[in-house]
């Protein structure tokens, strides 16, 4: 593999459909600009869930309509994905790219299997 990226094997989303996991990378150098992308792999299809580019020491900024939020600390990125439903259960891969300064390094994790269980609807109270 290229750059080493580690992430937990399994995470269970909470009852509100929120899942959090840490994506950690082993930086070969002193990167100042890092790009983190979350990919969802279902069957053989891979789709981008969200992406953020951040300067080391600064906050991650996802697009306003993104379902992801996150914080960074050193070579760790704490990612939170919101609004998940049971149908979103799948393998979520963390991709890290060291964009600046050169050289460019990239790596992908083995993926975090996120399980989402839709809450049971509340029974009607008489």
């Amino acid at each position: 593999k290229a750059m080493h990226v580690a992430q937990p094997a399994v995470v269970l989303a909470n009852s509100r459909g929120t899942a959090s996991f840490v994506c950690e990378y082993a930086s070969p150098g002193k990167a100042t600009e890092v790009r983190v992308t979350v990919l969802r792999q279902a069957d053989s299809q891979v789709t981008e869930v969200c992406a953020a580019t951040y300067m080391m020491g600064n906050e991650l900024t996802f697009l306003d309509d993104s379902i992801c939020t996150g914080t960074s600390s050193g070579n760790q990125v704490n990612l939170t994905i919101q609004g998940l439903r049971a149908m979103d259960t799948g393998l979520y891969i963390c991709k890290v790219e060291l964009m600046y300064p050169p050289p460019y390094y990239m790596g992908i994790g083995n993926g975090t299997q996120i399980y989402v269980i839709d809450p049971e609807p509340c029974p009607d109270s008489d």
Epitope: K1, A2, H4, A26, S27, P28, G29, K30, L39, V46, I93, K95, E97, M99, P102, P103, Y104, Y105, M106, I108
Partner: antibody, heavy 115, light 107 residues
Framework: EVKLDETGGGLVQPGRPIKLSCVAS????????MNWVRQSPEKGLEWVAQ??????????YYSDSVKGRFTISRDDSKSSVYLQMNNLRTKDMGIYYC??????WGQGTLVTVSA | DIQMTQSPPSLSASVGETVTITCGAS??????LNWYQRKQGKSPQLLIY???NLADGMSSRFSGSGSGRQYSLKISRLHPDDVATYYC?????????FGGGTKLEIK
């Protein structure tokens, strides 16, 4: 200014060894995974070997075509990377480039294998 | 090992035209793809890294796109100076395989 200067190429007989050297300047050598890439008319560009840096315990990787015959090494104190090539074959002929990551490239040194 | 298939092997176009070179990987490389330009008698130069990012000092007429297994390099408003051989390369995994190259000529 970034510079990568390869030396050590030349004419060598099949089965004989040769050692290539590359001295780098103008960038942070210790932050780079260093590679050797070769170019031949038959095969175009071909990645040969990589040595990673201290955070990666100087791990080494080789293409199948050179595994067991070539050895890559580095000396961070001299900003240098080396390629020891043993048991050379005619198909090893070509221009050998030293690269920092894959961003910085040297001018190359020509290795000719012939009896 | 990941195989990289580049097409076309050669290409002839007129100054001012737009040309596209494609590169296919034998498996998903997650955007881990570089493009290089090699001019006659010169060393290869990094052109695009991470599938879409333009390397320092390269003309914005070059752009990269693609994901998964399929990638392309577009050269807009072709210049005589663009005559070169272009290579794609997998940078996700070792061995870091290159495509076979595309030789670009001007009509």
């Amino acid at each position: 200014e970034v510079k990568l200067d390869e030396t050590g190429g030349g004419l060598v007989q099949p089965g004989r060894p040769i050692k290539l050297s590359c001295v780098a300047s103008g960038f942070t050598f210790s932050d780079n995974w260093m590679n050797w890439v070769r170019q031949s008319p038959e095969k175009g560009l071909e990645w040969v070997a990589q040595i990673r840096n201290k955070p990666y315990n100087y791990e080494t990787y080789y293409s199948d075509s050179v595994k067991g015959r070539f050895t890559i090494s580095r000396d961070d104190s001299k900003s240098s990377v080396y390629l020891q090539m043993n048991n050379l074959r005619t198909k090893d002929m070509g221009i050998y480039y030293c690269t920092g990551g894959f961003t910085y490239w040297g001018q190359g040194t020509l290795v000719t294998v012939s009896a | 090992d990941i195989q990289m298939t580049q097409s076309p092997p050669s290409l002839s176009a007129s100054v001012g035209e737009t040309v596209t070179i494609t590169c296919g990987a034998s498996e998903n490389i997650y955007g881990g793809l570089n493009w290089y330009q090699r001019k006659q008698g010169k060393s290869p130069q990094l052109l695009i890294y991470g599938a879409t990012n333009l390397a320092d000092g390269m003309s914005s007429r070059f752009s990269g796109s693609g994901s998964g297994r399929q990638y392309s390099l577009k050269i807009s408003r072709l210049h005589p100076d663009d005559v070169a051989t272009y290579y794609c390369q997998n940078v996700l995994n070792t061995p870091y395989t290159f495509g076979g190259g595309t030789k670009l000529e001007i009509k």
